[in-house]
């Protein structure tokens, strides 16, 4: 089931994934200039079965003002240095992501895309917070939230984070010590 | 109490364009995704697309992606969607829902007629 | 997409019939909702999460179900309850409903 509203914003802080339930939805999103090919893809989702997830199609963009046909590579390291996920300036995916049953991983690039990645959660996503550069994080519990259903309608959790001006960055989890791993979170609505 | 207040019946000309208003009130207007759903005279419903009010992006059913424009207005709680080049296929009855889930309020619809 | 098949299309019942009415998926879906209308109205919320009552909804409407088959049901047709009813699905976009059973009197 997909979350109908956004993860809680946090001043001066920055979320992201480190990895993607099953029925995730990324839009193929591609940068100006450039648009989807005829008959490609809108979405890419985030499908499998109890051993193994992965992205089902693939995001194709074309030069808007030609039809010349495109290839999926891998952007050079100046373009992929802009690039960043939704709502997110951090870098892309810690090399020592957990590897979650029913979870995929972040997507790779594909040419010309657009500089935000657009997703649309489903219930049972758990996002991570840090702040942004230049602050510190003050925990009061997780700094994570969850999108959970209550009565039909989704929200989520609010991130236990306050971030002061001092000039000490957090780091994402998995980037600084394993933290548990949320497949055991409750996917299902939430009692009444 | 949740309300969502329609702009009223509109008739227009085909290649013409019309603007439907929804009204929220009795809930925190950015705190909710408004959709917009459309029903053909006799037929069943269909999803247009949303908007989140608080930073106006939108999801459309491709669909309707040439044809709807969604947008709102935050300081008078309002959403509103354009139909552009309007043809009699248009004609429909158009209704705003709040997201955030299931669709639990909806507005009382605006009958679009496009006719020569 | 996932197209939603409602069946019947129409349904003829008397008050006091027990009735049925199935909503079939094209692809699994984590819930199904239900909606009812009347003519001239707009939908009304009438089960979410494929077997919960929306407030003020009669023990008689139940839903159940699960992956692509899902199922509503009224225990004792009373007249209030003619009217079309809508599956609808939101696990994946672009969200889509089902063409609508009516309950119309026999």
């Known amino acids: 089931e997909l979350c109908d509203d956004d993860p809680p914003e946090i001043p001066h802080a920055t979320f992201k994934a480190m990895a993607y339930k099953e029925g995730t939805m990324l839009n193929c999103e591609c940068k100006r200039g450039f648009r989807r090919i005829k008959s490609g893809s809108l979405y890419m989702l985030c499908t499998g079965n109890s051993s193994h997830s992965s992205w089902d199609n693939q995001c194709q963009c074309t030069s808007s003002a030609t039809r010349n046909t495109t290839k999926q590579v891998t952007p050079q390291p100046e373009e992929q240095k802009e690039r960043k996920t939704t709502e997110m300036q951090s870098p892309m995916q810690p090399v020592d992501q957990a590897s979650l049953p029913g979870h995929c991983r972040e997507p790779p690039p594909w040419e010309n895309e657009a500089t935000e990645r657009i997703y649309h959660f489903v219930v049972g996503q758990m996002v991570y917070y840090q702040c942004v550069q230049g602050y510190r994080a003050l925990h009061r519990g997780p700094a994570e939230s969850v999108c959970k259903m209550t009565h039909g309608k989704t929200r989520w959790t609010q991130p236990q984070l306050i971030c002061t001006g001092e000039m000490e960055t957090s780091q994402f989890p998995g980037e600084e010590k394993p933290q548990a791993s949320p497949e055991g979170r409750p996917e299902s609505e939430t009692s009444c | 109490q949740v309300q969502l207040v329609q702009s009223g019946a509109e008739v227009k000309k085909p290649g013409s364009s019309v603007k439907v208003s929804c009204k929220a009130s009795g809930y925190t207007f950015t705190s909710y995704r408004m959709h917009w759903v459309r029903q053909a005279p006799g037929q069943g419903l269909e999803w247009i697309g949303y908007i989140r009010p608080k930073k106006g992006y939108t999801e459309y059913n491709q669909k309707f992606k040439d044809k709807a424009t969604i947008t709102a207005d935050e300081s008078t709680n309002t959403a509103y969607m354009e139909l552009s080049s309007l043809r009699s296929e248009d004609t429909a009855v158009y209704y705003c829902?709040?997201?955030?889930?299931?669709?639990?309020?909806w507005g009382q619809g605006t009958l679009v007629t496009v006719s020569s | 997409d996932i197209q939603m098949t409602q069946s019947p299309s129409t349904l003829s019942a008397s008050v006091g019939d027990r009735v049925t009415i199935t909503c079939s998926a094209s692809?699994?879906?984590?819930?199904m909702h239900w909606y009812q209308q009347k003519p001239g109205k707009a939908p009304k919320l009438l089960i979410y999460?494929?077997?919960n009552l929306a407030s003020g909804v009669p023990a008689r409407f139940s839903g159940s179900g699960s992956g692509t088959e899902f199922t509503l049901t009224i225990s004792s047709l009373q007249p209030d309850d003619f009217a079309t009813y809508y599956c609808h699905q939101r696990s994946t976009y672009p969200l889509t409903f089902g063409q609508g059973t009516k309950v119309e009197v026999k």
């Open positions: 692809s699994s879906i984590s819930y």
């Open positions: 999460t494929t077997s």
């Open positions: 829902a709040r997201g955030g889930g299931v669709f639990d309020y």
